[in-house]
Each structure stands twice: as structure tokens, then as C-alpha cells.
């Protein structure tokens, strides 16, 4: 059975539907069972903090990135680390906290409509989940200029949020990552916690917009940990 929460990344003011589902023989669908969806009860609470091992940034929360815990440390041992705030040093976009991106080695605000007018950007990109390339090093990829004539609209396939138009972020939608709207005040968000069981979120939501954070909805404080509803709220 699909032992997960079937919620989507579309922005809704209602809680995601709970419960499992399965594609049984003879039913009308062919299902992909057992995939970890966001918002489920498989995350540990922050009190049970454990360094979460990872292979890529995507396996970490929105406020985290995947890296070796020590500078020049064993590349084979990577964990989810807290994202870098504005003006902190970085090597790639994922290291910077939501709402920021990495420019010239420093996390800067993405409100400045970066990349507009820039025809090409050279990025460091690694292949696959194992971060390996044919020669064992990250390769430098120059993105073709056509990608930057127009920024991706909602639904456009992307690799990073900088591929998307203003007000959109790049979030997984199973087959690929696509541009989705950044969440507004009152909209349901996914509170990323350490994963208790390994699995990718295949239907991700964007992060909350500027000035908002993902917090437990006030009238849900009494609910059990697993069913607490998080919404984007003013700081």
C-alpha cells in the first residue's frame, strides 16, 4: 500500500488529505506504492536530532544543504547542514537559505531578480545521486542562452529556483522538478524535519515567501505531532 500522505505541492489553504492508497490488481490505476510524500508522519521531531546522512541537497530540508561536516572532510560522509544566511560564504545555491542564492561565493537575496539580463551562467553541477561524474570531478556546465531569454513559468521544468520566474521556486513534482508558486500567508507548508526513514519527497511544496515562516497553525497545537498542520505565517 501507499504508506504515505497523499498531498500535493499545489498551494491550498486546506490540510492535505491523509491516508494510504494502493493500486490493486483490477483497479483502475497502476500505482507507485511506498513513495515518501511531504507532510507525512515519517519525520522525527527536532528533539530527536540526529545528523541526517545524505547524498544530495534534495534529501535535506529546505533550510539545509548536503555536505561533508568538516572542510576537506571525507566526501563519502555527508550530512544535512543548516543553510547559510545572507552574506555568508557559499559554493552553490543550495547552501543558501530560502529566498537567497549564491553569487560570487556569497549568499545574497534573490529579490534582486538575479539572472535577468544575464545570458549565460556557469554553474557547478554533479551527476546523479552519487555525485559522481565520468572523470570523478564536478563538471562546469554553461547553460544555453535560450534558458534565460524567458524565466520558467509555473509548470516549466527546472533544475534550480533561478530557472523560474519571480514568485516561483523549483520543486520536485515526481518526474522532474518544476516551477511552482512560492507560498503565501496562510497557505499550507511542509515543515522539514529530520527524516526518520529514508525516502525522497516526490511532490514538494515551495518554501514560504519573504517575511513568512512555516509554523504550526495556532489551533492545531493540541493535535498529535504527526497531524499538526503547518502554514506560512508572519515572523
Amino acid at each position: 500500500t501507499l504508506n504515505s500522505v497523499l498531498n500535493s505541492n499545489a498551494i491550498k489553504n486546506l490540510p492535505p488529505p491523509l491516508g494510504g492508497a494502493a493500486g490493486h490488481p483490477g483497479s483502475a490505476v497502476s500505482a507507485a506504492p511506498g513513495i515518501l510524500y511531504p507532510g507525512g508522519n515519517k519525520y522525527q521531531t527536532i528533539d530527536n536530532y540526529q545528523p541526517y546522512p545524505c547524498a544530495e541537497d534534495e534529501e535535506c530540508g529546505t533550510d539545509e544543504y548536503c555536505a561533508s561536516p568538516t572542510r576537506g572532510g571525507d566526501a563519502g560522509v555527508q550530512i544535512c547542514l543548516a543553510c547559510r544566511k545572507r552574506r555568508k560564504r557559499c559554493m552553490r545555491h543550495a547552501m543558501c537559505c530560502p529566498g537567497n542564492y549564491c553569487k560570487n561565493g556569497i549568499c545574497v537575496s534573490s529579490d534582486q531578480n538575479h539572472f535577468r539580463g544575464e545570458i549565460e551562467e556557469t554553474i557547478t553541477e554533479s551527476f546523479g545521486n552519487d555525485h559522481s561524474t565520468l572523470d570523478g570531478y564536478s563538471r562546469r556546465t554553461t547553460l544555453s542562452s535560450k534558458m534565460y531569454h524567458t524565466k520558467g513559468q509555473e509548470g516549466s521544468v527546472c533544475l534550480r529556483s533561478s530557472d523560474c520566474a519571480s514568485g516561483l521556486c523549483c520543486a520536485r513534482h515526481f518526474w522532474s522538478k518544476i516551477c511552482k508558486p512560492v507560498l503565501k500567508e496562510g497557505q499550507v507548508c511542509t515543515k522539514h524535519r529530520r527524516k526518520g526513514s529514508h525516502g525522497l519527497e516526490i511532490f514538494q511544496r515551495c518554501y514560504c515567501g519573504e517575511g513568512l515562516s512555516c509554523r504550526i497553525q495556532k489551533d492545531h497545537h493540541q493535535a498529535s505531532n504527526s497531524s499538526r498542520l503547518h502554514t506560512c505565517q508572519r515572523h
Epitope: 509555473e154 521544468v157 515526481f174 518526474w175 525522497l200
Partner: antibody, heavy 112, light 111 residues
């Protein structure tokens, strides 16, 4: 339980149009995209395009751009794929997919 | 010319290990787009075997594994069983076509 139930098999003449439906249930229809994929007898899978169930925005594979129209009716949680100017090599099984769930397929036969 | 190329057929005896390759280019697999693998039994819809390069849905035996490196991906089936006889397809996205693409498909025969 998530279900994608497709309409029944169709037999069409060359030059005609066919409209295949895909009724979704068990989830919030407007939260997901519906893709259409076809498979000619003995051949591989071929992506035709998608529709955003909420906005109705569509993206079509270039091959089908001039002949395909994808639409949806949110009130009945149903997606539609219409293919016009049918030719014999459009004979195929047409699947709708929510990416993680697939319909069972609709067989469309084009024959004079 | 197919975008994602797979061997048209592979075969193996029960218990053996087989590998199915999926070769793409710098505009699909090599551009860091994810690869998914499907199994299709005759007359049925495709069934997801591996998602996002190397993740296995529950219900899929751990005999199936996926990997991705450079411009290609592989599906490995260890300990072949008779019920594995089916067609297998890889899938990714291609930014030059602005389209999702499937591999040419591989027919697996269990001898």
C-alpha cells in the same frame, strides 16, 4: 484510493478526431498535472503532453502540437485528450497519468 | 533517432543478474535530469520500478536497483525470476525538446 478511469475503446476513420477522457478520484484533482502517453502496438511509450488540472495550462510534445488539445473539467475531475486528423499510425493505447498513477489505457484504432 | 537508447533485448537464466542500460545525452540525463524506470507486462499500464535514479517504491523487490552516471543510467536486476519477463523503459526529461522522453524499451527474456 487514487483512481484514473479512462473511457472505452474507440474505432475511428482516417481524418476523424477522437476524444479520450480520464476521470480522477481519490485525490484533489486540481493539485496535480495529468500527462498523456501513448503506445502503438508493439512499440514504445511516447509522451504527448500535460495539462495543469488547476489552471488548464498545457504543454504539448512538438510532434503533436498541431493536432492535440488537452482540456479538463474541474467540476467532474476529468481530463480530456482530443487528437484530430487521425491517421492509421495513430492506432495506439492512450494512457493518462498523474505521474505516480496511471490509467489502464484507452485503445484507439484508426482504420478505413 | 531515439533520445534515450536501450538495448532492444536482454536475457538471462533464473538467478542470474542482468543490467539494462539507458544512454542519453547532455540535454537529458547528462543535464542532471532524473531517470525513472518502468516495467510493463503485456496488456497492462507501466509500473514504476525505480524513481529519481535509484529509489525503489515499497512493493518492488530489492533485486531491482538503479544508478545514473554521466549521460547514462542503468537498471540492474539481480536474481532473475520468471515473473521479471517484461518490457522495461527508462524515462527522463530533455531540455532541447522541452519534453519528457522514454527510452526505446528493452524486452527481458528469462530463459
Amino acid at each position: 484510493e487514487v483512481q484514473l478511469v479512462q473511457s472505452g475503446a474507440e474505432v475511428k476513420k482516417p481524418g476523424a478526431s477522437v476524444k479520450v477522457s480520464c476521470k480522477a478520484s481519490g485525490y484533489t484533482f486540481t493539485d496535480y498535472y495529468i500527462h498523456w502517453v501513448r503506445q502503438a502496438p508493439g512499440q514504445g511509450l511516447e509522451w504527448m503532453g500535460w495539462i495543469h488540472s488547476n489552471s488548464g495550462a498545457t504543454t504539448y510534445a512538438q510532434k503533436f502540437q498541431a493536432r492535440v488539445t488537452m482540456s479538463r473539467d474541474t467540476s467532474s475531475s476529468t481530463a480530456y485528450m482530443e487528437l484530430s486528423r487521425l491517421e492509421s499510425d495513430d492506432t495506439a493505447m492512450y494512457f493518462c497519468s498523474r505521474e505516480d498513477y496511471w490509467g489502464k489505457g484507452t485503445m484507439v484504432t484508426v482504420s478505413s | 533517432q531515439a533520445v534515450l537508447t536501450q538495448p532492444s533485448s536482454v536475457s538471462g537464466a533464473p538467478g542470474q543478474r542482468v543490467s539494462i542500460s539507458c544512454t542519453g545525452s547532455s540535454s537529458n540525463i547528462g543535464a542532471a535530469y532524473d531517470v525513472h524506470w518502468y516495467q510493463q507486462l503485456p496488456g497492462t499500464a507501466p509500473r514504476l520500478l525505480i524513481y529519481v535514479n535509484n529509489n525503489r517504491p515499497s512493493g518492488v523487490p530489492d533485486r531491482f536497483s538503479g544508478s545514473k552516471s554521466g549521460t547514462s543510467a542503468s537498471l540492474v536486476i539481480a536474481g532473475l525470476q520468471a515473473e521479471d519477463e517484461a518490457d522495461y523503459y527508462c524515462q527522463s526529461y530533455d531540455n532541447s525538446l522541452n519534453a519528457y522522453v522514454f527510452g526505446t524499451g528493452t524486452k527481458l527474456t528469462v530463459l
